[in-house]
């Protein structure tokens, strides 16, 4: 009789579909992730099963707490889709599909500087390119550790460009750029390039 009651409950909102989620949705290969399969009903003893496409990854029992499945994303096919099943006696419901986005981390970008020197000004063009990493890549340019550009999004493998005009400075300035894609908390910086102060023939990047 209990099984019948559980199955009847399934047909109402008392036993809705489970929820499958992960704190990390954008991952890189080799990353460990935790997937949480949870259910609104906190009083029932529930058996949770995790699937990826058409393979079974594991089963856990839980009551009141979500089931936690720990995985390592090492191959492209491991992005998903995943789904979890909540089962009580002979009755079950499935979650919606969940997929990770696998992103290759950006490598350190290379900063190139081109300068056109006039008597009063320096017209500076900064180019920044990261040759590896999943697109799109956001580039930001810095002068003396202060951002001087907005984030420039590049959807193809070409350098980001930023132009600025400066009065001929009296002291040297340091430029660098940052490359960042969808991987959270993962940004790389170029080596700094120092622009010498004016005075004498001290503009190695200048177009004469």
């Amino acid at each position: 009789r209990k099984a019948v009651l559980d199955c009847e409950a399934m047909k109402t909102n008392e036993f809705p579909s489970p929820c499958l989620d992960s704190k990390t949705k954008v991952v890189m290969k080799g990353q460990n992730v935790s997937m949480f399969c949870s259910h609104k009903n906190k009083s029932l003893q529930i058996t949770y099963s995790l699937f990826r496409r058409k393979t079974h990854l594991g089963t856990q029992d839980g009551k009141g707490e979500p089931a936690i499945f720990n995985l390592s994303i090492t191959e492209a096919h491991e992005s998903g889709p995943y789904k979890c099943k909540a089962q009580v006696t002979s009755c079950s419901k499935y979650s919606r599909d969940f997929s990770f986005t696998i992103v290759d981390p950006v490598t350190s970008p290379v900063l190139n500087i081109m300068v056109i020197q006039t008597e009063t000004d320096r017209h500076i063009t900064l180019h920044c390119l990261s040759v590896n990493g999943s697109l799109p890549i956001n580039y930001t340019f810095f002068e003396n550790h202060v951002a001087i550009s907005p984030a420039i999004s590049k959807y193809d493998r070409e350098p980001a460009e930023f132009n600025l005009t400066k009065k001929n400075p009296g002291e040297e300035e340091e430029y660098r750029c940052e490359a960042k894609n969808r991987l959270p908390n993962y940004a790389t910086y170029s080596h700094p390039v120092t622009m010498p102060s004016t005075g004498g023939d001290s503009c190695p990047f200048c177009l004469k």
């Epitope: 496409r53 058409k54 393979t55 079974h56 191959e75 096919h77």
Partner: antibody, heavy 119, light 112 residues
Framework: EVQLVESGGGLVQPGGSLRLSCAAS????????ITWVRQAPGKGLEWIGT???????YYSTWAKGRFTISRDNSKNTVYLQMNSLRAEDTAVYYC?????????????WGQGTLVTVSS | AIQMTQSPSSLSARVGDRVTITCQSS????????LSWYQQKPGKAPKLLIY???RLASGVPSRFSGSGSGTQFTLTISSLQPEDFATYYC????????????FGTGTKVTVL
């Protein structure tokens, strides 16, 4: 070349044991699932059990307890340990590989090895 | 236990005929489409023809097609060729009582 080669079949007495091997080449068992299937003479195909890329094992109801599937990643080989063998276990035993993340879409098969249980 | 029943168990046909084989499962397969079809010739290992109930496996001629969902599935050969005389099996994947697979009973296609 991707292939599976079974070995270890032969004549065994009722009540005896036998271990079949399935040597995989051209791919890694840490990515693919291997399934054992058997076919008695003149009969249909019968699923025995499966070991997936995570090492999880699954068995047919009738095979549970008597048959055990294991693998050795260093040798890229899967094993089928068969105990308490009976005359009705006489069959050709196949191992087969599934698609990635699809345990039972069996697209690569071994040639099969014959097991005869008789006194 | 899950039952996978194929019908007919055998059939005779001519080259050029349209042939239909059905597979009836006692329970719904996982995802409603975890079903594949295999061809086996005497003394040989089976060969995958169809997966996901209706998707053609690599290298399989387009005269083979599959359909169905849940518990009822069909394999169709639109125009039977001499090399198609063989035995055909369906294979379902299930998660109702553990992660489980079951073959159909088989259908032997012979020359009329």
């Amino acid at each position: 070349e991707v292939q599976l080669v079974e070995s270890g079949g032969g004549l065994v007495q009722p009540g005896g044991s036998l271990r079949l091997s399935c040597a995989a080449s051209g791919f890694s068992l840490t990515i693919y699932t291997i399934t054992w299937v058997r076919q008695a003479p003149g009969k249909g195909l019968e699923w025995i059990g499966t070991i997936n890329s995570y090492g999880n094992t699954y068995y047919s109801t009738w095979a549970k307890g008597r048959f055990t599937i294991s693998r050795d990643n260093s040798k890229n080989t899967v094993y089928l340990q068969m105990n308490s063998l009976r005359a009705e276990d006489t069959a050709v035993y196949y191992c087969a590989r599934g698609y990635v993340d699809s345990d039972w879409y069996l697209n690569i098969w071994g040639q099969g090895t014959l097991v005869t249980v008789s006194s | 236990a899950i039952q996978m029943t194929q019908s007919p168990s055998s059939l005779s046909a001519r080259v050029g005929d349209r042939v239909t084989i059905t597979c009836q499962s006692s329970e719904s397969v996982y995802d409603n489409n975890y079903l594949s079809w295999y061809q086996q010739k005497p003394g040989k290992a089976p060969k995958l023809l169809i997966y996901d109930a209706s998707r053609l496996a690599s290298g399989v001629p387009s005269r083979f097609s599959g359909s169905g969902s849940g518990t009822q599935f069909t394999l169709t050969i639109s125009s039977l060729q001499p090399e198609d005389f063989a035995t055909y099996y369906c294979l379902g994947g299930y998660d109702s009582s553990g992660w489980y697979a079951a073959f159909g009973t088989g259908t032997k296609v012979t020359v009329l």
